[in-house]
């Protein structure tokens, strides 16, 4: 089974664009676009801080931490209203991701 040029293996993703901007109040806002070839029952999400195909139920229920979106050793918490999640590093630094 050979992949054509530009074709993704089933269940995988690639980053298409990564924009960093607006360093306000010591905050960097990043917007990332990914291209995924997800299997039936999966949808594009984030695992270990990288684009990944995840169980579609996770997105439907907004249980974002079930994607394992944070790096190993970081703590994941849902934002109020399940609008996204935070990843807390051992040193206390917090990275917030909102889903739009």
């Amino acid at each position: 089974q050979f992949l054509k040029e530009g074709q993704l293996a089933a269940g995988t993703c690639e980053i298409v664009t990564l924009d960093r901007c607006c360093n306000k109040n010591r905050r960097t806002i990043a917007r990332q676009t990914a291209r995924c070839a997800c299997r039936k029952g999966q949808i594009a999400g984030t695992t270990r801080a990288r684009p990944a195909c995840v169980d579609a139920r996770i997105i439907k229920t907004k249980q974002w931490c079930d994607m394992l979106p944070c790096l190993e050793g970081e703590g994941c918490d849902l934002l109020i209203n399940r609008s996204g999640w935070t990843c807390t590093q051992p040193g206390g630094r917090i990275k917030t991701t909102t889903v739009s």
């Epitope: 269940g11 695992t47 079930d66």
Partner: antibody, heavy 120, light 107 residues
Framework: QVQLQESGPGLVKPSETLSLTCTVS????????WSWIRQPPGKGLEWIGY???????NYNPSLKSRVTISVDTSKNQFSLNLKSVTAVDTAVYYC??????????????WGQGTTVTVSS | DIQMTQSPSSLSASVGDRITISCRAS??????LNWYQQTPGKAPRLLIY???TLQSGVPSRFSGGGSGTDFSLTITSLQPEDFATYYC?????????FGQGTKLDIK
């Protein structure tokens, strides 16, 4: 280094419920998926199910009507309940950590296994 | 369910030999294939994930290959500790299914 330890009764009577607990030490239970697998005597491995940090689950359809996997993050434990057991449920039961290696979910840390015999 | 079929079911070899175990999926699973080693009385041990990526701490004499429906595990220069049962497992669907196992013993 993460270690897993299964615990529970080694003998269960037919029609009763098999209950096992897996205690995770050396790491947070919230950072991975967790799984139960079993192996009947002299046979191969059978996947029972997964549990996610939120408590959401995926089960093997062949066992779905009888199985419940739950998690207690405060104790760093997850558990298996299998109801209405019969002799065919006699097996070594393993708990395992499921690691998302990029896109490839694999069970990279296993408990040593606990033998459960179903007999009256 | 995806069915995983291993061949052969058993295999006899000598220390120093090179052996290959095959695993076939009943439908395409891309490279979502893991290999485990199990010695008697012990828990399985992850050897390879993603069809070809060696798990940390696993000797380089182990290698995996394949994609789609056909996969292989190769051990070059067998060592005494390699005589065990090997299982493939797909991670592309629910339920996760294992092959029936290949028992490797000393000739």
């Amino acid at each position: 280094q993460v270690q897993l330890q299964e615990s529970g009764p080694g003998l269960v009577k037919p029609s009763e419920t098999l209950s096992l607990t897996c205690t995770v030490s050396g790491g947070s239970i919230s950072s991975y998926y967790w799984s139960w697998i079993r192996q009947p005597p002299g046979k191969g491995l059978e996947w029972i199910g997964y549990i996610y940090p939120s408590g959401s689950t995926n089960y093997n359809p062949s066992l779905k009507s009888r199985v419940t996997i739950s998690v207690d993050t405060s104790k760093n434990q997850f558990s298996l309940n299998l109801k209405s057991v019969t002799a065919v449920d006699t097996a070594v039961y393993y708990c395992a950590r499921v690691n998302p290696f990029g896109y490839y979910y694999a069970m990279d840390v296993w408990g040593q296994g606990t033998t459960v015999t179903v007999s009256s | 369910d995806i069915q995983m079929t291993q061949s052969p079911s058993s295999l006899s070899a000598s220390v120093g030999d090179r052996i290959t175990i095959s695993c076939r999926a009943s439908q395409s699973i891309s490279t979502s294939l893991n290999w485990y080693q199990q010695t008697p009385g012990k828990a399985p041990r992850l050897l390879i994930y993603g069809a070809s990526t060696l798990q940390s701490g696993v000797p380089s004499r182990f290698s995996g290959g394949g994609s789609g429906t056909d996969f292989s595990l190769t051990i070059t220069s067998l060592q005494p500790e390699d005589f065990a049962t090997y299982y493939c497992q797909e991670s592309a669907s629910i339920p996760r299914t294992f092959g029936q196992g290949t028992k490797l013993d000393i000739k």
